[in-house]
């Protein structure tokens, strides 16, 4: 386990010509904040893909209002560090994505609106513990300097956070059961990761992947009793004076979850898991608000008005996680048919079909189209031996010759309004209720349901479908 | 081809009625839209007067006209504005409109002139 | 809700930029519900922009809408003598009401 750290130093426009002046202008004053997004691996992953090693959320910077006779200057920047926690082992090679967002702070309807003003995406090998490492990146007219590092967080060290060290409990000597951890002088070693199954209450082991039982136990991962004994559930290194195995430190000694978390044990580590309100690696992290903007990937934040009231993040379809950061496998159903290769591109789903075979699922056979014809944009689609036409948007029938109404399902939830424009269904709520199908009151049992940010939904904002 | 037509205008005396008829071709009220009645007075800009939602039959009215103007749905491409009361500053082009979405006039009829003189 | 453009009239030079202003007393719906058009003599107004920025179909780029919530922008950059026209914006606001702004007549020289 550990935190990746980093620190933006300045964001404003490049040089030449052509560069902005201002990321707010004639849109009143605004603001800046960051978003950071961390993925495992070298490789060109979608934009979408989620952020597998984490991320996080800045806060919002000064407010900036453009005077128009000075020069561009670099923007005022939010205080502080970004960090994100990583549970696992820090992968050495990964992708790190920025992205700068504008808020906007004239009237709008329901509070601020959102933009993103600019991404950079670096693919880096970075070992855990090493120096800070400077970079300046070029987005659009854009350019952002910054330094990061990856750092362990005790009971881990080393390059990839995979050892697990706690510092000494006296100065000469490391506690029951730990050994200094070379070449570390000032932390000891932890017991090895035993054998996968071994009993975490019946087991121990001296090298990893062995399995050793207390007196009492046997079998391959000791959860075989034998027979009774004083010792009998004790685990830890032998006492010399009673020749029982004694109790050693688990991860969970001491509980390290703040805030009321609760901790479980995970092979050589732990896992908190933190009341609402708290998050990160040992709910830490708290007074969060939805004004944090803490749901990623369109979620919808609710309550959590101010820091002593936990917020709930509404997830969009594709997203689950307290704050809407895991995306779920959707192309796990194997949804395309006839080999079709599956694409989860996060607001869609996708296949690409083999040769031979289309629509939205490779569901058709295209053979059986030849000479027909579809009106108003429709496709032929293969039907057992017979075509039928996939139609457009707006057009329904067996060529597509009807008129189809996009809303006819109801789609817009209390008593929004359904229109059927031509780039899709399109919703506009009554008052009181916001989202692209107005699923959401505004003031729930007095409640505000803020949006989260970045980009989030306003009350009463439509989207397109 | 899409289009809107509007009819029903004419010469009119103050206090007198008058009921304009909007007719779609192309399109049906099948589909979810708001039916909408702007005017326009001789060298102003457009006035929205009143829409009538397909999808249901909900209708919205500017709060100057209401009371005064009724507007309805007569049949699946028709759409009616019943006026009344008249007076001389009602005077306009009438022109039928459709909102298919984003709260903007995609679609216009030519306009029909009503004039209200004694 | 009231929709207020300015300046009018506008005049510009062919091949010239014109700006052209248009405040509302609230916010539009979802921020963004605010359209452009353009009306001729004996003719309905035509629209060139809707939901703020978005292009209709058929309308050239030089065509430009921008702004948020209560203040919007309409922008025609490289003027043709065909844009001499009068310019109105307008709203849709929550509750289903619908306002027009009062027109900019734009003279291409």
């Known amino acids: 386990a550990g935190v990746f750290e980093l620190q933006i130093h300045s964001f404003g426009p490049g040089p030449g010509p052509g560069a902005p002046r201002s990321p707010c202008s004639a849109r009143g004053p605004c603001r800046l904040f960051f978003r950071v997004c961390l993925k495992p691996g070298l490789s060109e992953e979608a934009a979408e893909s989620p952020c597998a090693l984490g991320a996080a959320l800045s806060a919002r910077g000064p407010v900036y209002t453009e005077q128009p006779e000075a020069p561009a200057p670099d923007l005022p920047l939010p205080n502080g560090l970004l960090q994100v926690p990583f549970r696992d082992a820090w992968p050495g090679t990964f992708s790190l994505i920025i992205e700068t967002w504008r808020e906007e702070l004239g009237d709008q309807i329901g509070g601020p609106a959102w933009s993103l003003l600019a991404r950079v995406t670096r693919r880096r090998r970075l070992a855990a513990g090493g120096p800070w490492a400077r970079d300046i990146q070029r987005a659009g007219a854009w350019e952002l300097r910054f330094s990061y590092r990856a750092r362990c967080e005790l009971p881990a060290v080393g390059t990839a956070c995979t050892r697990l060290c706690r510092p000494r409990s006296a100065p000469s000597r490391c506690g029951p059961g730990l050994r200094p951890c070379a070449p570390l002088e000032d932390e000891c070693e932890a017991p090895p990761v035993c054998r996968a199954g071994c009993s975490l209450e019946h087991g121990f082991c001296e090298q990893p992947g062995e399995c050793r039982c207390l007196e009492g136990w046997t079998g391959p991962l000791c959860t075989v009793p034998a027979s009774t004994s004083s010792c009998l559930g004790l685990r830890g290194p032998s006492s010399a004076t009673t020749g029982c195995l004694v109790p050693g430190p688990g991860p969970c000694d001491g509980n390290p979850c703040a805030n009321g978390g609760s901790c479980s044990e995970t092979p050589g580590s732990f896992e908190c898991t933190c009341p609402r309100g708290f998050y990160g690696l040992r709910c830490e992290v708290s007074g969060v608000t939805c004004a944090d903007g803490p749901c990623f990937n369109g979620g919808l934040c609710v309550g959590g008005a101010d820091p002593d009231s936990a917020y709930i993040c509404h997830c969009p379809p594709g997203f689950q996680g307290s704050n809407c950061e895991k995306r779920v496998d959707r192309c796990s159903l194997q949804p395309c048919r006839n080999g079709g290769l599956c694409l989860d591109l996060g607001h869609a789903l996708r296949c690409r079909c083999r040769a031979g075979f289309a629509g939205p699922r490779c569901e058709h056979n295209l053979d059986d189209c030849a000479g027909r014809a579809c009106a108003n944009g429709g496709t032929c689609v293969e039907g057992g031996g017979a075509h039928r036409c996939s139609c457009a948007l707006g057009f329904g029938g067996r060529d597509c010759r009807e008129r189809a109404d996009p809303c006819a399902a109801r789609p817009c939830a209390h008593g929004g309004r359904c229109y059927a424009h031509f780039s899709g269904l399109v919703c506009a709520c009554a008052p009181g209720y916001m989202g692209s199908r107005c699923e959401f009151p505004v003031h729930p049992d007095g409640v505000s349901a803020l949006p989260a940010a970045p980009p989030g939904l306003r009350p009463g904002d439509p989207q397109r479908h | 081809q899409e289009q809107l037509v509007e009819s029903g205008g004419g010469l009119v005396q103050p206090e007198g009625s008058l009921t304009l008829t909007c007719t779609a071709s192309?399109?049906?009220?099948?589909?979810?839209?708001?039916m909408c009645w702007v005017r326009q007075a001789p060298g102003k800009g457009p006035e929205w007067i009143a829409c009538?939602?397909?999808?249901?039959?909900?209708t919205d009215y500017a709060s100057w006209a209401k009371g005064r103007f009724t507007v309805s749905k007569a049949s699946s491409t028709t759409v009616t504005l019943q006026m009344t009361s008249l007076a001389v500053a009602d005077t306009a082009t009438y022109f039928c409109?459709?909102?298919?979405?984003?709260?903007?006039?995609?679609?216009w009829g030519p306009g029909t002139l009503v004039t209200v003189s004694s | 809700q009231v929709l207020t453009q300015t300046p009018s009239p506008v005049s510009a030079a062919v091949g010239g930029t014109v700006t052209i202003s248009c405040q509302s007393t609230?916010?539009?719906?979802?921020?963004?519900?605010l359209s452009w058009y353009q009306q001729k003599p004996g003719q309905p107004p035509k629209v060139l922009i809707y939901?703020?920025?978005n292009l209709e179909i058929g309308v050239p780029s030089r065509f430009k809408g921008s702004g948020s919530g209560t203040q919007f922008t309409l922008t025609i950059s490289g003027a043709q003598c065909d844009d001499a026209a009068t310019y109105y914006c307008?709203?849709?606001?929550?509750?289903?009401?619908?306002?027009f702004g009062g027109g900019t007549e734009v003279v291409v020289k």
């Open positions: 409109a459709r909102n298919s979405g984003y709260g903007y006039f995609g679609l």
């Open positions: 192309g399109f049906s009220f099948s589909s979810s839209y708001d």
């Open positions: 009538i939602y397909t999808g249901d039959g909900s």
């Open positions: 609230e916010s539009v719906y979802g921020s963004d519900w």
């Open positions: 939901q703020a920025s």
């Open positions: 307008q709203g849709y606001y929550s509750g289903y009401i619908y306002a």
